[in-house]
Interface confidence: low
């Protein structure tokens, strides 16, 4: 028998300094956790103890704090090169800068095989990419060998910016003829490593012959097998055992995200290939792992640009951006318009002629905004003003729901109005007239949203069998303030681009705004 | 295209301040993520790094050298300036300027200008 | 600060031979390295960066190796145009330059 030990990280988002337990910014050093120094620390005292040691990463490095909006990527090939990474898998986030936001700083930088078997380059990008990326890659561990296939949401065009010129094809249509090739080449051991989500990669491991392993990506996925380390609750044991078609027992695994957690799997494979065993868990990086000196230096010596664009402007305002508890909780606020409207340009994506973009949508609870923006400062907004409206280091996820269920949600924003509760709804590409007088549960009597499916844009009544899309802080996709039934209905749920990133990135774009209280919230009865 | 061009003043003396001129086109210090630097290469020697200078005004200069070196720039001339008080003989070099790419290698190089510190 | 040791001042090759430079750093940059070309009169021009990522439009014949501190070009097949010296830099700290390699035909 051979003995494989696969390292993985997934989601990691920019994580690359330790964070609190919530992975947002660390407070307080001593119960802070995960970073790519103290991750470091772990991997090498494993790959010291242990023979056959892979690293790998399923994607989405990219995006998630201050470290991305400056270093655009650079951050990720460097220290993932410093960490040694064996093979990363594409994820959505890759490709949020673009095809050369992928291509300059990760692709042509990375020191290790970046993989996706299911996109496809054509026109005059599939030269220019060409080898940069691969379909697989088979390395060398110990005496043997290991194959690595690996694939990437479909859905990437509607979730990023790949442009116009990379097919995502159906993942398991795409990786059979990659695991059959590696077969053909004698590689008996191999892993699907991929982000597409934990019901993708249990179907991977169901329908693809020959993938032994799968390690995942993009759910942020909590397996455990015993008692949980720290907050997260597991979906199920680690590793997650599938079995295929044509019987075998497949180990599937994800190591939530954030750069938190190390997933840890070891397996035992026989002469020809087989998995006899597999076991293990992923490991909490708190601080009881140090964090590594050398890694550490270096994150200080990178940290440095990021104080000063802090404080560098970003683009003016030159109306007073309210957004304090007092309008925010209780009316349309134009704080709140401004951040819908820069979630809905973060999400255009032209894809189908028939819609002039796929989502229209916005909410955003109110008690989310934490701060407004005086303009008289010679109208300038930096990050670091951004960053105390939008403190919670959150990201702008996109949401399938039915019109049922954002009629239970609007319902939800109102059903205690006047306490200043965090509930009540900011929106865009959305009409909601409220009449107060009525009991709670049954206070909105109008509700129209924006049309996608049209090439002038206008409101229509919600339909409520109809599925939308929708554009949101993750906190209410999880179910935050009271928003049960959001976590509860949602149909799809892809985690977006981090909040303050969102919103800065349409402040440089606009140069100067001036977002007004225009209507979109209104109350039917009453003095409001 | 991508040009940079460097102009000094070709001879000056000891204790003086030696002031030079990068102008360049096919590119903006407006654009997130471009910098400028200064290299220097005394006649027949290696290469020197001196100073750099990003698109958000961020400087960094060589700490060997850092209290004799002022670099800053003019983003709507499209010219980065340094300057380096006091010098002396041993400043006599070739001064190049350069693109900064990525990190800190150096695509694009203007053709140099010699300098001569000389009594 | 790094430095960067070009030990062979000089090297010699014929058309059509191969030849390596080497640069070793005086501590871990890991794979932060460009290579440039500097022939006689003209600036330097870059070949390599990221240690192995040859820069577009730099014949294939230039290949870079390497990581943490030692560090290799070469260049496969030599021509005469390839009269030169060449230089390694280091980008991982401040950025500094090796002492050069100068390469002449025979």
């Known amino acids: 028998a051979w003995e494989l030990t696969i390292l993985h990280t997934n989601d990691v988002h920019s994580r690359l300094e330790q964070t609190s337990e919530d992975s947002s910014k660390c407070v307080n050093a001593s119960r802070c956790m995960g970073g790519v120094a103290r991750l470091f620390t772990k991997v090498q005292q494993i790959r010291r103890a242990e023979p056959n040691v892979l690293l790998l990463d399923a994607g989405d490095q990219y995006q998630g704090t201050i470290w991305f909006t400056v270093y655009k990527g650079a951050e990720v090939a460097h220290f993932m090169n410093a960490l040694r990474y064996d093979a990363m898998a594409l994820g959505n986030h890759e490709f949020d800068n673009g095809v050369e936001g992928l291509i300059e700083p990760l692709l042509k930088e990375a020191k290790f095989p970046i993989l996706s078997a299911n996109i496809k380059a054509k026109g005059p990008l599939a030269s220019q990419i060409s080898g940069l990326y691969l379909p697989y890659k088979v390395l060398p561990v110990g005496d043997e060998v290991v194959g690595i296939v690996g694939y990437t949401s479909k859905e990437t065009p509607f979730l990023s910016n790949p442009g116009t010129n990379l097919v995502f094809e159906d993942e398991i249509t795409a990786l059979q003829p990659e695991v059959d090739k590696l077969k053909t080449l004698n590689v008996n051991k191999i892993i699907a490593l991929g982000h597409s989500g934990f019901e993708m990669d249990k179907l991977i491991a169901q329908k693809v012959r020959g993938v032994d392993v799968v390690v995942g990506g993009h759910s942020n996925t909590f397996l455990y097998t015993g008692n949980p380390p720290s907050k997260e609750v597991p979906a199920g044991k680690y590793p997650f055992i599938v079995t295929s078609d044509d019987g075998r027992k497949v180990p599937v695994v994800q190591a939530y995200a954030f750069g938190k957690y190390l997933g840890y799997l070891k397996i035992e494979f026989d002469e020809r290939g087989n998995v006899i065993s597999s076991h293990g868990n992923p490991i909490l990086l708190n601080s009881s792992i140090p964090e590594d000196p050398s890694i550490k230096a270096d994150i200080n010596k990178w940290r440095i640009k990021l104080d000063n664009y802090s404080t560098q402007e970003l683009g003016k305002t030159i109306v007073y951006l309210d957004g304090s508890s007092q309008s925010c909780r209780f009316r349309e606020c134009n704080m709140g318009n401004l951040i819908c409207d820069a979630m809905i340009n973060n999400n255009l994506r032209h894809t189908d002629e028939m819609f002039w973009n796929h989502v229209s949508m916005c909410i955003l609870n109110g008690g989310g905004i934490r701060s407004p923006i005086d303009e008289r400062n010679n109208g300038t907004i930096t990050w670091e003003n951004l960053a105390a409206v939008l403190p919670f280091g959150g990201t702008f996820d996109l949401v399938q729901l039915k019109g049922s269920t954002l009629k239970k949600a609007f319902e939800h924003s109102v059903h205690r109005y006047g306490q200043s509760t965090g509930e009540f709804l900011q929106v865009g590409g959305i009409h909601v007239v409220y009449d107060l007088s009525r009991k709670p549960g049954d206070r909105v009597v109008k509700l129209d949203v924006l049309c996608t499916k049209c090439r002038v844009p206008s409101y229509d009544p919600l339909k409520m069998d109809e599925v939308y899309k929708v554009i949101l802080p993750n906190f209410l996709a999880n179910g935050g303030d009271g928003f049960q039934m959001i976590k509860d209905e949602l149909l799809r749920h892809d985690s977006g681009d981090q909040d303050i990133n969102v919103v800065s990135t349409y402040i440089s774009k606009m140069k100067v705004i001036y977002p007004a209280v225009e209507g979109r919230i209104k109350f039917s009865t009453g003095s409001h | 295209q991508v040009t940079l061009k460097e102009s000094g003043p070709g001879i000056l003396k000891p204790s003086q301040t030696l002031s030079l001129t990068c102008s360049f086109s096919?590119?903006?210090?407006?654009?997130?993520?471009?910098?400028v630097g200064w290299i220097r290469q005394p006649s027949g020697k290696g290469l020197e790094w001196l100073a750099h200078?990003?698109?958000?005004?961020?400087?960094y200069y060589n700490p060997s050298l850092k209290s004799q070196l002022t670099i800053s720039k003019d983003t709507s001339r499209n010219q980065v300036f340094l300057r380096i008080a006091s010098v002396d003989t041993a400043d006599t070099a070739t001064y190049y300027c350069a693109r900064r790419e990525r990190w800190a290698w150096f695509a694009y190089w203007g053709q140099g200008t010699l300098v001569t510190v000389s009594a | 600060d790094i430095v960067m040791t070009q030990s062979q001042k000089f090297m010699s090759a014929s058309v059509g031979d191969r030849v390596s430079v080497t640069c070793k750093a005086s501590q871990n940059v890991f794979t932060n390295v460009a290579w440039y070309q500097q022939k006689p009169g003209q600036s330097p021009k870059v070949l390599i960066y990221s240690a192995s990522y040859r820069y577009s439009g730099v014949p294939d014949r230039f290949t870079g190796s390497g990581s943490g501190t030692d560090f290799t070009l070469t260049i496969n097949n030599v021509q005469s145009e390839d009269l030169a010296e060449y230089f390694c830099q280091q980008y991982n700290s401040y950025p500094t330059f090796g002492s050069g390699t100068k390469l002449e035909i025979k």
């Open positions: 200078i990003w698109w958000d005004d961020d400087k």
């Open positions: 096919g590119f903006s210090l407006n654009t997130s993520g471009m910098g």
